[in-house]
Amino acid sequence: QGWQAFKNDATEIIPELGEYPEPPPELENNKTMNRAENGGRPPHHPFETKDVSEYSCRELHFTRYVTDGPCRSAKPVTELVCSGQCGPARLLPNAIGRGKWWRPSGPDFRCIPDRYRAQRVQLLCPGGEAPRARKVRLVASCKCKRLTRFHNQSELKDFGTEAARPQKGRKPRPRARSAKANQAELENAY
């Protein structure tokens, strides 16, 4: 399950480079769809330009089935996966033979989810069990976000909160750190 149908439709997104406003209330949940488990820092980019059209971000369409135990959605859902790289549009490798990547230095930019959409899905279950309805929140668009060292430390910038974001695995989150801090950490690692 998960990556049965991966359709690589890349779309460039032009970001905002200024200070980032608080996300709308309805976007607070699951700001990233994947865990920050590799612990690696995102690449740095040497470009200091203020021209927002210089930067872009890829949206990859991703089709999958929704599952709950043995139950599976009657139809697959399609959402976006925001590609991990952000950089000057002229260098972003969106097309074959188009430009080349750059050396890692300078400010961090990450391609992260911007807007979400909620979708109710009907799950069909084996053994004659009644279908069940679930709501999923799917990435609807991506954006490039400039992440300063301040954001990377992830202590004071509020990217939106969730009262009980699950953590995978067994690594405890230090109690001194807030959920908001953890949220920023996840965004940095997308």
Epitope: V136, E162, A164
Partner: antibody, heavy 124, light 106 residues
Framework: EVQLQQSGAEHVKPGASVKLSCTAS????????IHWVKQRTAQGLEWIGR????????EYAPRFQGKATIIADTSSNTAYLQLSSLTSEDTAVYYC?????????????????WGTGTTVTVSS | EIVLTQSPALMSASPGEKVTMTCSAS?????MHWFQQKPGTSPKLWIY???NLASGVPARFSGSGSGTSYSLTISSMEAEDAATYYC?????????FGAGTKLELK
């Protein structure tokens, strides 16, 4: 902060009805199912039912059919639980809870945000 | 409906002691969630989908199980762990909770 704020304690007479509210802040209830859970003093948790505020579709536990009615008002970002024909058995704390969702190579649903709880006391 | 039976109903443990509580389902379920509740407060998601710790839950907690048998384990009891723990399933309608295991500090 993401939270569910519930209405204050209610003291009602047997046979009466009561309507409890659950107002969401920092998220849109249309994006989630909102559930109601009952907890009697020093007892466990009982699921009452849930609503999809987007279209009002509801689902109830069999034992609460006819006893509970769940509605939602998306304009005020509020879900309601109405309890009818109250008896002493309905004396309890009632919680609303959000059915959260998370995807990480598989889908997860769980009650990630709980309301503050409303105490309902039924006595003459 | 699926009945969840938690045992023991009441237990006490000393600081540093290993604690295990179980949740037995009357029929097989795909996964189990666990909630922690302290007096006068709302329940909190503690472990989701059998073995995943919710945010802020110390690593001394773990969950395991499959089919009809699930458990929550604390590797080394601490004072702040004293609470009531509820298991919950939704593999089958209606959603059901266990009656809870009350864990006290010895």
């Amino acid at each position: 902060e993401v939270q569910l704020q519930q209405s204050g304690a209610e003291h009602v007479k047997p046979g009466a009805s009561v309507k409890l509210s659950c107002t969401a802040s920092d998220f849109n209830i249309k994006d989630y199912y909102i559930h109601w859970v009952k907890q009697r003093t020093a007892q466990g948790l009982e699921w009452i039912g849930r609503i999809d505020p987007e279209d009002g579709e509801t689902e109830y536990a069999p034992r609460f059919q006819g006893k509970a009615t769940i509605i939602a008002d998306t304009s005020s970002n509020t879900a309601y639980l109405q309890l009818s024909s109250l008896t002493s058995e309905d004396t309890a704390v009632y919680y609303c809870a959000r059915e959260g969702y998370y995807y990480d190579s598989r889908d997860y649903w769980y009650f990630d945000v709980w309301g503050t709880g409303t105490t309902v006391t039924v006595s003459s | 409906e699926i009945v969840l039976t938690q045992s023991p109903a009441l237990m006490s443990a000393s600081p540093g002691e290993k604690v295990t509580m179980t949740c037995s389902a009357s029929s097989s379920v795909s996964y189990m969630h666990w909630f922690q509740q302290k007096p006068g407060t709302s329940p909190k998601l503690w472990i989701y989908s059998t073995s995943n710790l919710a945010s802020g839950v110390p690593a001394r907690f773990s969950g395991s199980g499959s089919g009809t048998s699930y458990s929550l384990t604390i590797s080394s009891m601490e004072a702040e762990d004293a609470a009531t723990y509820y298991c919950q399933q939704w593999s089958s309608n209606p959603l059901t909770f266990g009656a809870g295991t009350k864990l006290e500090l010895k």
